[in-house]
């Protein structure tokens, strides 16, 4: 059966990094350059993905494999096998319309992508906020006013003056 | 075969004006969205800003009021104005093709022209 299935089909012996050639009597020719096949038995190889922009060369394009691409400094990688290089931000911002903008007071974002999100509410568990948030950095929620009760904790309760989440100005 | 071209960089003293111009083909221009991006030298690149199809355009805070980014889809040919210029502007300025309409976002099958170099300085 495997001897006669190759003679009906002579392309399932051609190996990955060949494609099967109808120009030349079937027979089993090497990929172009800037093309490649990953699998044996093709009729045509693919052609190499280019890292062009901001996108740079992870890995370059082989006979058997495609290319590989990640992205330049100040970008990273979105989507499956790096579709997508999205500009990075500081922390304390996230990408907008117009490019990289501070987080509005209240939010935070302690890396260089994503959005800037609420700073935690320590109230809603019952807790008091131990350190302010910034737009770098979450507030930091400590024991609940109870816990704090004479011999309960060592840790100093904060000053009184400012709101929960709110950042030193 | 796509083609983006840019011309009109050079050597020009702070405070200058210059326009970039970069040539398109072997795509629908009008139809695409387009941006300019930048290099400066040891640095990574910097989305500059874009134009929708529609004629909308985006700007980075820093280029915002100085820079003017323009389309002539009978020419098939990207613009940009830059006016007031700095030292931190230096840099290789590249057109490209924008196809996730996100701004600071680039697609793999994005069009890029191989940029020219603006230089600002006295």
């Known amino acids: 059966f495997e001897r006669t299935r190759s003679l009906q089909d002579p392309c399932s012996n051609c190996p990955a990094g060949t494609f099967c050639d109808n120009n030349r009597n079937q027979i089993c020719s090497p990929c172009p350059p800037n093309s490649f096949s990953s699998a044996g038995g093709q009729r045509t190889c693919d052609i190499c993905r280019q890292c062009k922009g901001v996108f740079r060369t992870r890995k370059e394009c082989s006979s058997t494999s495609n290319a590989e691409c990640d992205c330049t400094p100040g970008f990273h990688c979105l989507g499956a096998g790096c579709s997508m290089c999205e500009q990075d931000c500081k922390q304390g911002q996230e990408l907008t319309k117009k490019g990289c903008k501070d987080c509005c007071f209240g939010t935070f974002n302690d890396q260089k992508r994503g959005i800037c999100r609420p700073w935690t509410n320590c109230s809603l568990d019952g807790k008091s906020v131990l350190v302010n948030g910034t737009k770098e950095r979450d507030v930091v929620c400590g024991p609940s006013p109870a816990d704090l009760s004479p011999g309960a904790s060592s840790v100093t309760p904060p000053a009184p003056a400012r709101e929960p989440g709110h950042s030193p100005q | 075969e796509v083609q983006l071209v840019e011309s009109g960089g050079g050597l020009i003293q702070p405070g200058g004006s210059l326009r970039l111009s970069c040539a398109a083909s072997g795509f629908t221009f009008s139809s695409s969205a387009m941006s300019w991006a930048r290099q400066a030298p040891g640095k990574g690149f910097e989305w500059v800003s874009s134009i929708y199809s529609s004629g909308k355009t985006y700007y980075v805070e820093s280029v915002k009021g100085r820079f003017t980014i323009s389309r002539d889809n009978s020419k098939n040919t990207l613009y940009l104005q830059m006016n007031s210029l700095r030292a931190e502007d230096t840099a290789v300025y590249y057109c490209?093709?924008?196809?996730?309409?996100?701004?600071?976002?680039?697609?793999?099958?994005?069009?890029w022209g191989q940029g020219t170099l603006v230089t600002v300085s006295s």
């Open positions: 490209a093709r924008w196809k996730t309409l996100r701004v600071g976002v680039w697609d793999e099958s994005d069009y």
